[in-house]
């Protein structure tokens, strides 16, 4: 039979007969030696006759008295085996044993679930000596029990190298259900089923679960814990909780919000971080992600020139770091830029469009049709060219840079000339006779110096030569033209 004491048990004398009596005054269950009279308080039962030593772990002392009678076996007396009480109540229980006075230094230790209880526990051992035996009563009290106090408690005593162990006292702390698993917030796809889990434990068991959605009960009858709720799908955000019921009452889980994944909101605050002739660095602030992580973003770029054909360039990039360098743009051009981002559901609308401009760049092509003449009468070299196409000037021409290299008998000298943007010819004076002059020309804007044209070489003879002819930029493929005059 399970021996149990419930918290309603009334205080009663601790020790009848020869032991000093004490009354329990704290309204907590008090378990003690059975009464010699055989009387036991209500709701406290022992599995064997009161006062009889139990047959468990006993020590049979070898010492004999003067009359050489062997001493009776030593054993803890029976006490109540099972205590059921509510959380935060107090409890006191004890072990008792009568030990012949011939034994010295007997100590009782308390153990819970196989581990010795040391330190900060309210364990008191009292000794009541008589002529031949000493009654030892070890009391253990807990002022405010918690669930962690649940378990099996025993007393141990070492005597004569023998260990005496009491019967266990089972403490069962009952309370409201305690959640071991509560539903968790989730982001779910619209109209798609998903599961929520709720688990709670006693004691006392059983624990029954009710599910609540937006304050309406989902199941009108309880389900045994643990319970899994299959939600058949949602079209809008909902709040779920579960109620756990047992004989002590009800505990309600935290309410969790289940959000419906949606397309993101458009990005905001698209701004220009940096502009160059052919690129624009933009940043943006992502909009609300629609309860689903951003996957990537799309930058849309339109020429803002009303005469342009209105085509849109699209650049895809990762969602982080909310920064993108748009490349391959024309210099000195106006663009409208918008950003859109996507999650697993779809693309956001495009952000508000912003206007951005590229700066002037260095020209992207060299002047064309470069021609070089020797004007012997004035001892000059005349250079002519055609300006690069306007589209490829990448800015407003401010002039040209002419490189002329003079090579003669192991001597090489490079000179640079800057000329204004008006016109397409220049005259440079001959630096060295009997030498080769190599001419290259680059267009210049405020954005910088463009590429130099292919070199055009002209031979400058010694004084007195009469014939001369122009030297010009060759047809593509002739990399190193030389014209000897």
């Amino acid at each position: 039979a399970i021996t149990e004491a419930r918290e309603e048990a009334k205080p009663y004398p601790l020790f009848p007969g020869p032991f000093p009596g004490s009354l329990q005054t704290d309204h907590t269950p008090l378990l003690s030696l059975p009464h010699a009279s055989g009387y036991q308080p209500a709701l406290m039962f022992s599995p064997t006759q009161p006062g009889r030593p139990h047959t468990g772990n006993v020590a049979i002392p070898q010492v004999t008295s003067v009359e050489s009678k062997p001493l009776p076996p030593l054993a803890f007396k029976h006490t109540v085996g099972h205590i059921i009480l509510s959380e935060h109540k107090g409890v006191k229980f004890n072990c008792s044993i009568s030990v012949p006075n011939i034994y010295q230094d007997t100590t009782i230790s308390w153990w819970k679930d196989g581990k010795e209880l040391l330190g900060a526990h309210h364990a008191i051992t009292q000794f009541y000596p008589d002529d031949e035996v000493t009654a030892i009563i070890a009391s253990f009290s807990i002022t405010s029990v918690q669930r962690s106090d649940n378990g099996s408690y025993i007393c141990k005593m070492k005597i004569n190298n023998e260990e005496i162990v009491s019967d266990p006292i089972y403490i069962e702390v009952q309370g409201l259900p305690h959640f071991t698993k509560q539903p968790e917030s989730m982001n779910v796809t619209r109209n798609t089923a998903f599961n929520l889990t709720c688990q709670a434990v006693g004691p006392p068991e059983p624990v029954n679960i009710f599910w609540v959605q937006n304050s309406s009960r989902v199941n009108e009858q309880p389900e045994k814990s643990p319970s899994v709720l299959t939600v058949p799908g949602l079209t809008e955000m909902a709040v779920f909780s579960c109620e756990a019921h047992n004989d002590k009452g009800l505990t309600v889980s935290k309410g969790v919000q289940i959000n419906i994944k949606a397309i993101p909101s458009p990005p905001t605050e698209v701004s220009i971080r940096n502009s160059t002739a052919h690129s624009i660095l933009i940043s943006w602030v992502p909009g609300f992600d629609g309860y689903s992580p951003f996957r990537n973003c799309s930058i849309q770029v339109k020429e803002a020139d009303p005469l342009s054909n209105g085509s849109v360039m699209i650049f895809n990039t990762s969602a982080l770091p909310h920064l993108y360098q748009i490349k391959q743009l024309q210099a000195l051009a106006n663009y409208s830029i918008g950003v859109s981002c996507m999650n697993e559901i779809g693309w956001s609308a495009v952000s508000p469009w912003i206007l951005a401009s590229t700066t002037e760049g260095a020209p992207s092509v060299a002047p064309l049709n470069v021609t070089v003449f020797l004007n012997e009468s004035s001892d000059n070299v005349d250079i002519r060219w055609m300006k690069p196409p306007t589209k490829q000037q990448d800015g407003e021409l401010v002039g040209y840079r002419i490189s002329h290299v003079w090579q003669s008998a192991g001597i090489s000298k490079e000179l640079l000339e800057e000329v204004g943007q008006n016109g397409s010819r220049a005259r440079i004076s001959v630096q060295v006779h009997n030498a080769t002059c190599t001419v290259r020309i680059a267009a210049v804007t405020r954005g910088g110096v463009g590429p130099f044209s292919d070199p055009v070489k002209i031979f400058i003879p010694a004084h007195g030569w009469v014939d001369y002819a122009p030297s010009s930029t060759p047809a593509p493929g002739n990399a190193d033209p030389v014209l000897i005059i």
């Epitope: 109209n191 599910w211 959605q213 937006n214 309406s216 989902v218 199941n219 009108e220 009858q221 309880p222 389900e223 709720l229 299959t230 058949p232 799908g233 079209t235 909902a238």
Partner: antibody, heavy 118, light 106 residues
Framework: QIQLVQSGSELKKPGASVKVSCKAS????????MNWVRQAPGQGLEWMGW????????TYADDFKGRFVFSLDTSVSTAYLQISSLKAEDTAVYFC???????????WGQGTLVTVSS | EIVLTQSPDFQSVTPKEKVTITCRAS?????MHWYQQKPDQSPKPWIK???NLASGVPSRFSGSGSGTDFTLTINSLEAEDAATYYC?????????FGQGTKLEIK
């Protein structure tokens, strides 16, 4: 498989009482509540209420408070609907149906026709 | 209590036609269930929680909606679909049914 089998048709005089039974099989009777639904001739469905098969507690829709009583005998997995002081307007088919999550009536009895006529 | 109004009350339809039955609630509900009933039979569960077809229901049926407006749609009507369809709300007690929509095959 899950089945709800209802008792047969009844012909009653006004003022009499009738008790309709609904025997469940194929599942644990106390796991699901039992609803009662009325359908008057040529009319739509009306929810009368339900009984908690776990606690035995009945819940009645407003129009069905008073003369209508839901009861159980869990030992034979049976729910009952008793109507007292029968009136001609009680003539209808009465259905029992299991009460699932979200008040989904997944299983229905075949219906019991109660005719009240003098 | 929440009043459910179905429309139309009655519809005569030719096979292969698309049919839409609507159920409007007097205030917002969480889910709408649909049941099919044929003469002298008990109602059959048809669509659970707005959009989930019950076991054995043909895929030509679908359900949708939220808040106060819900629909049952039959993509291509077949003769066996002739029946009365009822909506039933979950979310507010007492539970209520719509008055029913009777579909007849021309």
């Amino acid at each position: 498989q899950i089945q709800l089998v209802q008792s047969g048709s009844e012909l009653k005089k006004p003022g009499a009482s009738v008790k309709v039974s609904c025997k469940a099989s194929g599942y644990t009777f106390t796991n699901y509540g039992m609803n009662w639904v009325r359908q008057a001739p040529g009319q739509g469905l009306e929810w009368m209420g339900w009984i908690n098969t776990y606690t035995g507690e009945p819940t009645y829709a407003d129009d069905f408070k008073g003369r209508f009583v839901f009861s159980l005998d869990t030992s034979v997995s049976t729910a009952y609907l008793q109507i007292s002081s029968l009136k001609a307007e009680d003539t209808a088919v009465y259905f029992c149906a299991t009460y699932g999550h979200y008040a989904w009536f997944a299983y229905w009895g075949q219906g019991t026709l109660v005719t009240v006529s003098s | 209590e929440i009043v459910l109004t179905q429309s139309p009350d009655f519809q005569s339809v030719t096979p292969k036609e698309k049919v839409t039955i609507t159920c409007r609630a007097s205030s917002s509900v969480s889910y709408m269930h649909w049941y099919q009933q044929k003469p002298d039979q008990s109602p059959k569960p048809w669509i659970k929680a707005t959009s989930n077809l019950a076991s054995g229901v043909p895929s030509r049926f679908s359900g949708s909606g939220s808040g106060t407006d819900f629909t049952l749609t039959i993509n291509s009507l077949e003769a066996e679909d002739a029946a009365t369809y009822y909506c039933q709300q979950w979310g507010t007690k007492p539970l209520t049914f719509g008055q029913g929509t009777k579909l007849e095959i021309k």
